[in-house]
Protein backbone atom coordinates (compact mmCIF):
# COMPACT_ATOMS: atom_id res chain seq x y z
CA UNK A 1 0.00 0.00 0.00
CA UNK A 2 1.05 3.73 -0.10
CA UNK A 3 3.28 5.36 2.43
CA UNK A 4 4.36 9.14 2.77
CA UNK A 5 7.72 9.54 1.22
CA UNK A 6 9.02 11.89 3.71
CA UNK A 7 9.09 12.37 7.84
CA UNK A 8 7.79 15.90 8.39
CA UNK A 9 4.01 15.70 7.23
CA UNK A 10 1.91 18.52 8.03
CA UNK A 11 -1.91 18.25 9.42
CA UNK A 12 -4.54 20.60 9.39
CA UNK A 13 -8.00 20.67 11.29
CA UNK A 14 -10.08 21.91 8.72
CA UNK A 15 -13.58 22.40 11.19
CA UNK A 16 -14.19 21.79 14.69
CA UNK A 17 -16.77 19.41 16.30
CA UNK A 18 -19.10 21.60 18.43
CA UNK A 19 -18.94 18.86 21.01
CA UNK A 20 -15.85 19.78 22.17
CA UNK A 21 -13.74 22.61 23.18
CA UNK A 22 -11.43 23.68 20.26
CA UNK A 23 -8.47 23.18 23.30
CA UNK A 24 -9.40 19.91 23.51
CA UNK A 25 -9.84 18.95 19.87
CA UNK A 26 -6.31 20.22 19.33
CA UNK A 27 -5.18 18.23 22.13
CA UNK A 28 -6.41 15.12 21.29
CA UNK A 29 -5.51 15.65 17.52
CA UNK A 30 -1.54 16.47 18.67
CA UNK A 31 -1.73 13.73 20.96
CA UNK A 32 -2.87 10.92 18.60
CA UNK A 33 -0.14 12.13 16.05
CA UNK A 34 2.12 11.52 18.86
CA UNK A 35 1.40 8.37 19.36
CA UNK A 36 2.66 7.29 15.95
CA UNK A 37 5.75 9.72 15.73
CA UNK A 38 6.97 8.18 19.37
CA UNK A 39 7.67 5.06 17.53
CA UNK A 40 8.57 6.00 13.89
CA UNK A 41 11.04 8.37 12.56
CA UNK A 42 8.13 10.88 11.22
CA UNK A 43 7.37 14.29 12.37
CA UNK A 44 3.80 15.73 12.79
CA UNK A 45 2.95 19.66 12.52
CA UNK A 46 0.03 21.48 12.68
CA UNK A 47 -0.61 23.86 9.65
CA UNK A 48 -3.51 26.82 10.27
CA UNK A 49 -3.74 27.57 6.10
CA UNK A 50 -2.74 26.49 3.06
CA UNK A 51 -2.49 22.74 1.92
CA UNK A 52 -1.73 20.31 4.81
CA UNK A 53 -0.85 16.37 4.15
CA UNK A 54 -3.66 15.44 6.00
CA UNK A 55 -7.10 17.24 6.37
CA UNK A 56 -8.25 16.12 9.80
CA UNK A 57 -12.54 17.17 8.63
CA UNK A 58 -15.79 16.64 11.00
CA UNK A 59 -18.60 16.47 8.69
CA UNK A 60 -22.08 14.65 8.61
CA UNK A 61 -23.79 12.90 5.62
CA UNK A 62 -22.56 13.22 2.18
CA UNK A 63 -19.47 14.89 2.66
CA UNK A 64 -17.01 15.24 -0.70
CA UNK A 65 -16.07 11.62 -1.18
CA UNK A 66 -18.03 8.21 -1.97
CA UNK A 67 -18.56 7.17 1.54
CA UNK A 68 -21.09 9.49 2.76
CA UNK A 69 -21.50 8.76 6.67
CA UNK A 70 -24.51 7.32 8.13
CA UNK A 71 -25.39 9.51 11.50
CA UNK A 72 -24.99 7.86 15.05
CA UNK A 73 -23.58 4.74 15.80
CA UNK A 74 -22.25 2.50 12.97
CA UNK A 75 -19.24 4.41 10.70
CA UNK A 76 -17.61 6.71 13.14
CA UNK A 77 -14.81 8.13 11.21
CA UNK A 78 -12.70 6.81 7.98
CA UNK A 79 -9.07 8.10 6.65
CA UNK A 80 -7.64 7.87 3.05
CA UNK A 81 -4.51 6.24 2.66
CA UNK A 82 -1.19 8.50 2.40
CA UNK A 83 -1.34 10.47 -1.05
CA UNK A 84 -2.42 13.69 -2.82
CA UNK A 85 -5.44 15.71 -2.70
CA UNK A 86 -8.00 13.47 -0.41
CA UNK A 87 -4.67 11.21 0.59
CA UNK A 88 -4.36 10.87 4.19
CA UNK A 89 -7.19 12.94 4.56
CA UNK A 90 -9.07 11.81 8.19
CA UNK A 91 -12.96 12.14 8.27
CA UNK A 92 -14.99 12.18 11.55
CA UNK A 93 -18.83 11.84 11.71
CA UNK A 94 -20.17 14.88 13.24
CA UNK A 95 -23.14 13.08 14.30
CA UNK A 96 -21.29 11.10 16.65
CA UNK A 97 -20.81 12.76 20.14
CA UNK A 98 -17.28 13.52 20.33
CA UNK A 99 -15.53 13.77 23.58
CA UNK A 100 -12.20 13.81 26.09
CA UNK A 101 -13.39 10.65 28.34
CA UNK A 102 -15.42 7.42 28.09
CA UNK A 103 -19.05 8.75 27.48
CA UNK A 104 -19.69 9.52 23.60
CA UNK A 105 -16.58 8.73 21.31
CA UNK A 106 -13.72 9.64 22.43
CA UNK A 107 -11.77 11.45 19.71
CA UNK A 108 -7.80 11.07 20.68
CA UNK A 109 -8.60 6.75 20.35
CA UNK A 110 -10.40 7.25 17.30
CA UNK A 111 -8.03 9.62 15.68
CA UNK A 112 -5.09 7.34 16.42
CA UNK A 113 -6.96 4.53 14.71
CA UNK A 114 -7.76 6.95 11.92
CA UNK A 115 -4.40 8.69 11.48
CA UNK A 116 -3.30 5.15 11.60
CA UNK A 117 -4.79 4.59 7.96
CA UNK A 118 -3.58 8.24 7.18
CA UNK A 119 -0.04 6.67 7.77
CA UNK A 120 -0.94 3.68 5.79
CA UNK A 121 -1.53 0.96 8.02
CA UNK A 122 -4.90 -1.29 7.12
CA UNK A 123 -6.79 -2.89 9.66
CA UNK A 124 -5.32 -5.18 12.61
CA UNK A 125 -6.93 -8.92 13.66
CA UNK A 126 -5.55 -8.41 17.02
CA UNK A 127 -8.44 -7.36 19.20
CA UNK A 128 -5.83 -5.65 21.81
CA UNK A 129 -4.28 -3.48 18.63
CA UNK A 130 -5.88 0.08 18.21
CA UNK A 131 -6.06 -0.86 14.01
CA UNK A 132 -8.60 -3.57 15.26
CA UNK A 133 -11.57 -2.29 13.27
CA UNK A 134 -14.27 -2.04 15.72
CA UNK A 135 -13.87 0.88 18.35
CA UNK A 136 -13.68 -0.10 22.68
CA UNK A 137 -12.94 2.54 24.93
CA UNK A 138 -9.54 1.97 26.97
CA UNK A 139 -8.51 4.33 29.43
CA UNK A 140 -6.83 7.36 27.71
CA UNK A 141 -4.00 7.71 30.32
CA UNK A 142 -2.64 4.53 30.29
CA UNK A 143 -3.06 4.04 26.30
CA UNK A 144 -0.53 2.20 25.02
CA UNK A 145 -0.72 0.72 20.82
CA UNK A 146 -0.28 -2.88 20.96
CA UNK A 147 2.76 -4.69 19.46
CA UNK A 148 1.27 -5.40 16.51
CA UNK A 149 0.48 -1.64 16.07
CA UNK A 150 4.32 -0.59 16.40
CA UNK A 151 5.13 -4.06 14.05
CA UNK A 152 2.78 -2.57 11.34
CA UNK A 153 3.94 1.24 11.64
CA UNK A 154 7.61 0.61 12.09
CA UNK A 155 7.49 -2.08 8.54
CA UNK A 156 6.75 1.07 6.83
CA UNK A 157 8.32 3.69 7.95
CA UNK A 158 11.24 2.45 10.78
CA UNK A 159 11.95 2.67 13.95
CA UNK A 160 12.53 6.26 15.58
CA UNK A 161 16.09 7.73 15.51
CA UNK A 162 18.02 7.30 18.78
CA UNK A 163 17.77 11.27 19.43
CA UNK A 164 14.06 11.01 19.17
CA UNK A 165 13.74 7.65 21.22
CA UNK A 166 15.70 9.03 24.17
CA UNK A 167 14.31 12.38 24.41
CA UNK A 168 16.93 13.48 26.71
CA UNK A 169 14.66 13.55 29.93
CA UNK A 170 16.72 14.39 32.55
CA UNK A 171 18.53 17.53 30.15
CA UNK A 172 21.78 16.50 30.12
CA UNK A 173 24.25 17.51 27.89
CA UNK A 174 23.22 15.56 24.33
CA UNK A 175 26.07 13.98 22.48
CA UNK A 176 27.68 16.39 19.92
CA UNK A 177 29.00 13.71 17.61
CA UNK A 178 26.07 11.47 17.95
CA UNK A 179 25.17 11.23 14.39
CA UNK A 180 21.31 11.47 15.11
CA UNK A 181 21.85 14.88 16.46
CA UNK A 182 19.29 17.87 15.45
CA UNK A 183 19.66 21.77 16.65
CA UNK A 184 16.36 23.62 17.82
CA UNK A 185 18.28 26.73 16.56
CA UNK A 186 21.72 28.01 15.10
CA UNK A 187 22.84 32.16 14.19
CA UNK A 188 25.96 33.98 13.86
CA UNK A 189 26.94 36.13 16.53
CA UNK A 190 29.70 37.73 15.04
CA UNK A 191 32.74 35.56 14.01
CA UNK A 192 31.17 32.87 16.14
CA UNK A 193 28.02 30.18 15.36
CA UNK A 194 25.92 29.59 18.18
CA UNK A 195 24.18 25.78 17.87
CA UNK A 196 21.18 25.71 20.63
CA UNK A 197 19.61 22.67 21.76
CA UNK A 198 17.37 21.88 24.32
CA UNK A 199 18.96 24.05 27.89
CA UNK A 200 22.52 24.14 25.77
CA UNK A 201 24.46 26.23 22.94
CA UNK A 202 27.49 25.05 21.55
CA UNK A 203 30.26 28.12 20.45
CA UNK A 204 31.91 27.24 17.32
CA UNK A 205 34.42 30.18 16.44
CA UNK A 206 34.99 30.04 12.59
CA UNK A 207 37.13 27.98 11.34
CA UNK A 208 39.00 26.82 14.79
CA UNK A 209 38.40 22.80 15.41
CA UNK A 210 37.60 23.47 19.20
CA UNK A 211 34.24 23.84 20.68
CA UNK A 212 32.96 25.02 23.85
CA UNK A 213 29.09 23.78 25.15
CA UNK A 214 27.32 26.11 27.59
CA UNK A 215 24.33 26.54 29.38
CA UNK A 216 22.24 29.07 28.00
CA UNK A 217 21.22 30.21 31.35
CA UNK A 218 24.86 30.87 32.69
CA UNK A 219 25.13 33.24 29.16
CA UNK A 220 21.87 34.82 29.77
CA UNK A 221 20.37 34.22 33.23
CA UNK A 222 16.73 35.69 31.89
CA UNK A 223 16.30 33.46 28.83
CA UNK A 224 14.20 30.53 29.32
CA UNK A 225 15.83 26.89 27.53
CA UNK A 226 14.44 25.33 24.41
CA UNK A 227 15.36 28.49 21.92
CA UNK A 228 13.23 27.68 18.59
CA UNK A 229 14.80 30.40 16.28
CA UNK A 230 17.49 32.77 16.22
CA UNK A 231 18.88 35.16 13.81
CA UNK A 232 21.65 37.53 13.84
CA UNK A 233 21.55 41.54 12.20
CA UNK A 234 25.44 42.14 12.49
CA UNK A 235 25.60 45.83 11.18
CA UNK A 236 23.81 46.52 14.32
CA UNK A 237 24.87 44.02 16.87
CA UNK A 238 21.61 42.54 17.54
CA UNK A 239 20.76 39.10 17.76
CA UNK A 240 16.89 38.14 17.88
CA UNK A 241 15.55 34.70 20.15
CA UNK A 242 13.00 32.93 19.64
CA UNK A 243 10.49 30.67 21.92
CA UNK A 244 6.70 29.94 21.41
CA UNK A 245 5.17 33.65 20.79
CA UNK A 246 8.22 35.27 22.13
CA UNK A 247 11.08 37.33 21.52
CA UNK A 248 13.98 38.81 23.09
CA UNK A 249 16.67 40.90 21.80
CA UNK A 250 20.23 40.95 22.63
CA UNK A 251 22.33 43.37 22.01
CA UNK A 252 26.34 43.32 22.18
CA UNK A 253 25.83 39.85 23.54
CA UNK A 254 23.65 41.65 26.91
CA UNK A 255 19.65 40.93 27.08
CA UNK A 256 17.86 44.00 26.17
CA UNK A 257 15.41 45.47 29.05
CA UNK A 258 11.69 44.88 27.99
CA UNK A 259 11.83 42.04 26.89
CA UNK A 260 10.40 39.66 25.81
CA UNK A 261 7.72 41.03 23.49
CA UNK A 262 5.51 39.30 21.30
CA UNK A 263 6.29 37.48 18.14
CA UNK A 264 3.30 39.36 16.52
CA UNK A 265 4.96 42.86 16.71
CA UNK A 266 6.72 41.44 13.47
CA UNK A 267 3.07 41.22 12.03
CA UNK A 268 2.36 37.91 12.08
CA UNK A 269 -1.33 36.89 11.71
CA UNK A 270 -2.54 35.25 15.21
CA UNK A 271 -2.53 31.79 13.69
CA UNK A 272 1.26 31.60 14.25
CA UNK A 273 1.97 30.11 17.44
CA UNK A 274 5.82 30.22 17.48
CA UNK A 275 8.71 30.18 14.92
CA UNK A 276 10.82 27.39 13.40
CA UNK A 277 13.65 29.14 12.28
CA UNK A 278 14.55 32.47 11.14
CA UNK A 279 18.07 34.28 9.43
CA UNK A 280 18.50 37.42 8.27
CA UNK A 281 20.57 38.13 4.91
CA UNK A 282 22.11 41.31 4.70
CA UNK A 283 22.92 41.64 1.08
CA UNK A 284 18.69 42.28 1.38
CA UNK A 285 18.05 43.26 4.64
CA UNK A 286 15.36 41.30 4.48
CA UNK A 287 14.64 38.31 7.37
CA UNK A 288 13.07 34.99 6.73
CA UNK A 289 11.04 33.36 9.24
CA UNK A 290 10.13 29.90 8.86
CA UNK A 291 6.93 28.82 10.76
CA UNK A 292 5.63 25.15 9.77
CA UNK A 293 5.76 24.43 5.65
CA UNK A 294 5.55 28.06 4.82
CA UNK A 295 8.28 31.70 5.09
CA UNK A 296 7.33 34.98 5.71
CA UNK A 297 9.87 37.55 4.55
CA UNK A 298 10.39 40.71 6.77
CA UNK A 299 11.72 44.03 5.59
CA UNK A 300 14.49 45.00 8.59
CA UNK A 301 14.43 48.83 7.56
CA UNK A 302 11.15 49.30 7.20
CA UNK A 303 9.96 47.59 10.10
CA UNK A 304 7.40 45.61 8.35
CA UNK A 305 6.78 42.19 6.40
CA UNK A 306 6.68 42.78 2.80
CA UNK A 307 3.43 41.74 0.78
CA UNK A 308 2.88 38.32 -0.68
CA UNK A 309 3.44 36.11 2.24
CA UNK A 310 3.79 33.68 3.61
CA UNK A 311 4.97 30.98 0.58
CA UNK A 312 5.89 28.00 0.76
CA UNK A 313 9.01 26.84 1.66
CA UNK A 314 9.47 24.09 -1.00
CA UNK A 315 8.36 26.44 -4.03
CA UNK A 316 10.73 28.82 -3.31
CA UNK A 317 13.80 26.94 -1.66
CA UNK A 318 14.26 24.12 -4.30
CA UNK A 319 15.25 20.95 -2.05
CA UNK A 320 14.20 22.45 1.14
CA UNK A 321 11.24 21.96 3.59
CA UNK A 322 8.48 21.21 3.83
CA UNK A 323 9.58 22.34 7.21
CA UNK A 324 13.04 22.72 8.97
CA UNK A 325 14.49 23.10 12.12
CA UNK A 326 16.96 25.69 12.34
CA UNK A 327 19.19 28.02 9.46
CA UNK A 328 22.01 30.41 9.38
CA UNK A 329 23.66 32.96 7.10
CA UNK A 330 27.48 32.74 5.87
CA UNK A 331 29.96 33.36 3.77
CA UNK A 332 27.90 36.11 1.69
CA UNK A 333 26.08 33.26 0.07
CA UNK A 334 24.93 30.67 1.62
CA UNK A 335 21.86 30.00 3.81
CA UNK A 336 22.23 26.66 5.94
CA UNK A 337 19.30 24.60 6.65
CA UNK A 338 19.06 22.01 9.31
CA UNK A 339 16.13 19.30 9.33
CA UNK A 340 17.05 16.62 12.05
CA UNK A 341 20.27 15.37 11.85
CA UNK A 342 20.57 16.61 8.09
CA UNK A 343 21.96 20.20 6.56
CA UNK A 344 22.01 21.43 3.40
CA UNK A 345 24.71 24.31 2.43
CA UNK A 346 21.95 26.56 -0.21
CA UNK A 347 23.25 29.09 -2.23
CA UNK A 348 20.61 31.76 -2.40
CA UNK A 349 22.12 33.87 -5.88
CA UNK A 350 22.01 30.04 -7.38
CA UNK A 351 18.94 29.01 -5.43
CA UNK A 352 19.92 25.46 -5.30
CA UNK A 353 21.10 23.05 -2.66
CA UNK A 354 25.34 23.15 -2.79
CA UNK A 355 26.16 20.63 -0.40
CA UNK A 356 24.53 18.15 2.15
CA UNK A 357 25.92 17.27 5.38
CA UNK A 358 24.97 16.05 9.22
CA UNK A 359 24.01 18.76 11.37
CA UNK A 360 26.99 18.12 13.27
CA UNK A 361 29.53 18.39 10.51
CA UNK A 362 30.95 21.78 12.23
CA UNK A 363 32.40 19.86 15.12
CA UNK A 364 35.20 17.99 13.18
CA UNK A 365 32.46 14.70 14.46
CA UNK B 1 1.22 2.25 -20.61
CA UNK B 2 -2.16 2.63 -18.97
CA UNK B 3 -5.24 1.09 -20.93
CA UNK B 4 -8.84 0.59 -20.50
CA UNK B 5 -10.88 -1.03 -23.19
CA UNK B 6 -14.97 -0.82 -23.15
CA UNK B 7 -16.60 -3.79 -24.68
CA UNK B 8 -20.36 -5.00 -24.74
CA UNK B 9 -22.72 -2.12 -26.03
CA UNK B 10 -24.78 -1.69 -28.87
CA UNK B 11 -28.67 -1.43 -29.64
CA UNK B 12 -31.27 -3.09 -27.25
CA UNK B 13 -34.91 -2.68 -26.65
CA UNK B 14 -36.10 -0.99 -23.89
CA UNK B 15 -36.71 -3.83 -20.71
CA UNK B 16 -33.55 -5.33 -22.31
CA UNK B 17 -30.68 -6.41 -20.56
CA UNK B 18 -26.88 -6.22 -21.98
CA UNK B 19 -23.49 -6.70 -20.22
CA UNK B 20 -20.56 -4.13 -20.54
CA UNK B 21 -16.85 -5.27 -20.16
CA UNK B 22 -13.62 -3.04 -19.11
CA UNK B 23 -10.33 -5.07 -19.93
CA UNK B 24 -7.42 -3.43 -17.98
CA UNK B 25 -3.99 -3.60 -18.84
CA UNK B 26 -0.71 -1.77 -17.87
CA UNK B 27 -1.58 -0.78 -14.21
CA UNK B 28 -2.16 -3.73 -11.05
CA UNK B 29 -6.22 -3.42 -11.12
CA UNK B 30 -7.09 -5.30 -7.83
CA UNK B 31 -5.76 -2.40 -5.74
CA UNK B 32 -7.72 0.46 -7.19
CA UNK B 33 -11.64 1.28 -6.98
CA UNK B 34 -13.30 1.29 -10.55
CA UNK B 35 -16.02 3.04 -12.07
CA UNK B 36 -18.76 3.71 -14.61
CA UNK B 37 -19.34 7.21 -16.66
CA UNK B 38 -21.93 7.65 -19.17
CA UNK B 39 -22.36 10.01 -21.57
CA UNK B 40 -26.16 10.87 -23.49
CA UNK B 41 -25.57 12.11 -26.81
CA UNK B 42 -24.80 15.92 -26.77
CA UNK B 43 -25.26 16.05 -23.07
CA UNK B 44 -22.61 16.19 -19.81
CA UNK B 45 -21.00 13.65 -17.96
CA UNK B 46 -22.80 11.25 -15.76
CA UNK B 47 -21.30 8.83 -12.55
CA UNK B 48 -22.99 5.75 -12.92
CA UNK B 49 -21.27 3.37 -10.21
CA UNK B 50 -18.14 2.61 -8.56
CA UNK B 51 -16.87 -0.73 -7.14
CA UNK B 52 -14.04 -0.99 -4.19
CA UNK B 53 -10.72 -2.97 -4.90
CA UNK B 54 -11.98 -6.56 -3.61
CA UNK B 55 -15.34 -6.14 -4.68
CA UNK B 56 -16.96 -4.23 -2.05
CA UNK B 57 -18.53 -1.87 -1.22
CA UNK B 58 -20.35 -0.81 -4.52
CA UNK B 59 -22.04 2.37 -4.86
CA UNK B 60 -24.58 3.37 -7.70
CA UNK B 61 -26.21 6.78 -9.00
CA UNK B 62 -30.26 7.32 -7.89
CA UNK B 63 -30.81 7.10 -11.69
CA UNK B 64 -29.64 3.31 -12.00
CA UNK B 65 -29.87 1.82 -8.28
CA UNK B 66 -32.15 -1.39 -8.67
CA UNK B 67 -31.57 -1.88 -12.88
CA UNK B 68 -27.54 -1.84 -13.26
CA UNK B 69 -25.28 -4.20 -10.86
CA UNK B 70 -21.44 -3.26 -10.78
CA UNK B 71 -19.07 -6.21 -10.48
CA UNK B 72 -15.34 -7.07 -10.76
CA UNK B 73 -13.02 -10.03 -11.36
CA UNK B 74 -9.43 -9.38 -10.09
CA UNK B 75 -8.23 -12.39 -11.76
CA UNK B 76 -9.06 -11.37 -15.00
CA UNK B 77 -8.11 -7.55 -14.66
CA UNK B 78 -12.13 -6.82 -15.71
CA UNK B 79 -14.83 -4.49 -14.76
CA UNK B 80 -18.08 -5.45 -15.80
CA UNK B 81 -21.43 -3.89 -15.37
CA UNK B 82 -24.78 -5.58 -16.08
CA UNK B 83 -27.58 -3.20 -17.24
CA UNK B 84 -31.14 -4.61 -16.68
CA UNK B 85 -34.59 -3.11 -17.12
CA UNK B 86 -32.78 -0.57 -19.85
CA UNK B 87 -35.15 2.40 -20.59
CA UNK B 88 -34.51 5.16 -23.20
CA UNK B 89 -32.88 7.56 -21.65
CA UNK B 90 -29.76 4.75 -20.96
CA UNK B 91 -29.13 5.43 -24.00
CA UNK B 92 -24.98 7.02 -23.76
CA UNK B 93 -21.55 6.04 -24.21
CA UNK B 94 -20.63 4.01 -21.27
CA UNK B 95 -17.05 5.22 -19.91
CA UNK B 96 -14.71 2.69 -17.64
CA UNK B 97 -12.02 4.85 -15.57
CA UNK B 98 -9.65 4.02 -12.91
CA UNK B 99 -10.02 5.73 -9.34
CA UNK B 100 -6.64 7.22 -8.37
CA UNK B 101 -7.12 5.62 -5.11
CA UNK B 102 -7.74 1.84 -3.10
CA UNK B 103 -9.10 1.20 0.20
CA UNK B 104 -11.78 4.39 0.08
CA UNK B 105 -13.00 6.62 -3.11
CA UNK B 106 -12.38 10.15 -3.02
CA UNK B 107 -13.30 9.98 -6.62
CA UNK B 108 -10.44 11.01 -8.49
CA UNK B 109 -10.48 9.64 -12.53
CA UNK B 110 -6.51 9.57 -13.68
CA UNK B 111 -7.25 6.78 -16.58
CA UNK B 112 -10.31 6.22 -18.94
CA UNK B 113 -11.18 3.87 -21.43
CA UNK B 114 -12.35 4.76 -25.20
CA UNK B 115 -16.45 4.26 -24.56
CA UNK B 116 -18.77 1.96 -25.87
CA UNK B 117 -22.03 3.10 -27.11
CA UNK B 118 -25.01 1.61 -25.66
CA UNK B 119 -28.51 2.35 -27.36
CA UNK B 120 -31.83 1.82 -26.24
CA UNK B 121 -34.39 2.19 -29.08
CA UNK B 122 -37.39 0.17 -29.69
CA UNK C 1 -27.33 16.18 -1.21
CA UNK C 2 -24.68 18.08 -2.70
CA UNK C 3 -24.89 20.01 -6.09
CA UNK C 4 -22.25 21.33 -8.50
CA UNK C 5 -23.19 24.31 -10.36
CA UNK C 6 -20.59 25.31 -13.43
CA UNK C 7 -20.55 28.71 -14.89
CA UNK C 8 -20.87 29.30 -17.71
CA UNK C 9 -22.21 26.70 -20.18
CA UNK C 10 -20.80 28.16 -23.16
CA UNK C 11 -18.02 30.62 -24.16
CA UNK C 12 -16.69 32.40 -26.99
CA UNK C 13 -12.90 33.16 -26.62
CA UNK C 14 -9.81 33.96 -28.85
CA UNK C 15 -6.37 32.46 -29.02
CA UNK C 16 -4.17 34.13 -26.39
CA UNK C 17 -7.30 34.99 -23.89
CA UNK C 18 -7.24 34.57 -20.53
CA UNK C 19 -10.51 32.61 -19.50
CA UNK C 20 -11.42 31.50 -16.33
CA UNK C 21 -14.95 29.15 -15.39
CA UNK C 22 -15.97 28.80 -12.38
CA UNK C 23 -18.17 25.60 -10.04
CA UNK C 24 -19.41 25.83 -7.06
CA UNK C 25 -20.80 23.44 -4.37
CA UNK C 26 -23.69 24.20 -2.30
CA UNK C 27 -21.83 22.88 0.63
CA UNK C 28 -18.10 23.09 1.60
CA UNK C 29 -16.22 19.99 -0.16
CA UNK C 30 -12.83 21.47 1.06
CA UNK C 31 -10.10 20.96 -1.92
CA UNK C 32 -11.72 17.89 -3.23
CA UNK C 33 -12.60 19.16 -6.60
CA UNK C 34 -11.29 17.81 -9.60
CA UNK C 35 -11.40 19.44 -13.56
CA UNK C 36 -11.72 17.21 -16.84
CA UNK C 37 -10.99 18.35 -20.14
CA UNK C 38 -12.71 16.40 -23.18
CA UNK C 39 -12.63 17.10 -26.90
CA UNK C 40 -15.35 15.56 -29.82
CA UNK C 41 -15.56 11.69 -29.71
CA UNK C 42 -12.93 11.26 -27.10
CA UNK C 43 -12.92 10.42 -23.62
CA UNK C 44 -12.08 13.07 -20.42
CA UNK C 45 -8.84 13.82 -19.02
CA UNK C 46 -8.10 14.51 -15.71
CA UNK C 47 -6.59 18.20 -15.63
CA UNK C 48 -6.03 19.40 -12.10
CA UNK C 49 -7.02 17.40 -9.30
CA UNK C 50 -7.34 18.26 -5.46
CA UNK C 51 -8.83 21.95 -6.53
CA UNK C 52 -5.56 23.35 -7.61
CA UNK C 53 -2.88 20.11 -8.10
CA UNK C 54 -1.83 19.72 -11.82
CA UNK C 55 -2.32 16.53 -13.48
CA UNK C 56 1.23 15.15 -14.69
CA UNK C 57 1.62 16.18 -17.98
CA UNK C 58 -0.50 19.25 -18.02
CA UNK C 59 0.48 22.38 -19.33
CA UNK C 60 1.18 25.47 -16.44
CA UNK C 61 -0.79 27.72 -18.59
CA UNK C 62 -3.93 25.80 -16.91
CA UNK C 63 -4.77 26.10 -13.10
CA UNK C 64 -6.76 25.74 -10.46
CA UNK C 65 -8.35 27.76 -7.40
CA UNK C 66 -10.97 28.04 -4.52
CA UNK C 67 -11.96 25.76 -1.93
CA UNK C 68 -14.75 25.04 0.16
CA UNK C 69 -17.64 25.82 -2.06
CA UNK C 70 -16.09 28.33 -4.94
CA UNK C 71 -13.27 27.10 -7.62
CA UNK C 72 -11.89 28.22 -10.51
CA UNK C 73 -10.21 26.62 -13.55
CA UNK C 74 -7.96 29.38 -15.52
CA UNK C 75 -6.25 28.97 -18.53
CA UNK C 76 -3.60 31.61 -18.94
CA UNK C 77 -3.31 32.17 -22.40
CA UNK C 78 -5.82 29.93 -24.72
CA UNK C 79 -3.96 28.18 -27.56
CA UNK C 80 -5.59 26.48 -30.34
CA UNK C 81 -5.63 22.97 -28.74
CA UNK C 82 -7.86 24.29 -25.57
CA UNK C 83 -10.99 24.53 -27.45
CA UNK C 84 -12.69 21.58 -25.53
CA UNK C 85 -15.26 21.07 -22.73
CA UNK C 86 -14.81 21.22 -19.55
CA UNK C 87 -16.39 19.38 -16.29
CA UNK C 88 -15.61 20.22 -12.56
CA UNK C 89 -16.04 17.05 -10.67
CA UNK C 90 -16.44 16.18 -6.68
CA UNK C 91 -16.84 12.30 -6.20
CA UNK C 92 -20.13 11.01 -8.08
CA UNK C 93 -20.66 14.76 -9.12
CA UNK C 94 -20.00 16.21 -12.88
CA UNK C 95 -20.29 20.09 -12.87
CA UNK C 96 -22.71 21.23 -16.39
CA UNK C 97 -19.92 21.55 -18.39
CA UNK C 98 -18.42 24.65 -19.81
CA UNK C 99 -17.94 24.42 -23.44
CA UNK C 100 -15.14 26.80 -24.65
CA UNK C 101 -15.63 27.79 -28.76
CA UNK C 102 -13.37 29.74 -30.90
CA UNK C 103 -14.40 33.13 -31.45
Known amino acids: GPVWRKHYITYRINNYTPDMNREDVDYAIRKAFQVWSNVTPLKFSKINTGMADILVVFARGAHGDFHAFDGKGGILAHAFGPGSGIGGDAHFDEDEFWTTHSGGTNLFLTAVHEIGHSLGLGHSSDPKAVMFPTYKYVDINTFRLSADDIRGIQSLYGDPKENQRLPNPDNSEPALCDPNLSFDAVTTVGNKIFFFKDRFFWLKVSERPKTSVNLISSLWPTLPSGIEAAYEIEARNQVFLFKDDKYWLISNLRPEPNYPKSIHSFGFPNFVKKIDAAVFNPRFYRTYFFVDNQYWRYDERRQMMDPGYPKLITKNFQGIGPKIDAVFYSKNKYYYFFQGSNQFEYDFLLQRITKTLKSNSWFGC | EVQLLESGGGLVQPGGSLRLSCAAS????????MHWVRQAPGKGLEWVSG????????FYADSIKGRFTISRDNSKNTLYLQMNSLRAEDTAVYYC???????????????WGRGTLVTVSS | DIQMTQSPSSLSASVGDRVTITCRAN??????LNWYQQKPGKAPELLIY???SLQSGVPSRFSGSGSGTDFTLTISSLQPEDFATYYC?????FGQGTKLEIK
Open chain 2, 97 to 111: AKDIRGAYSGGLFDY
Open chain 2, 26 to 33: GFTFSPYW
Open chain 2, 51 to 58: IGPSGGPT
Open chain 3, 27 to 32: QSIYTY
Open chain 3, 50 to 52: AAS
Open chain 3, 89 to 93: QQAGI
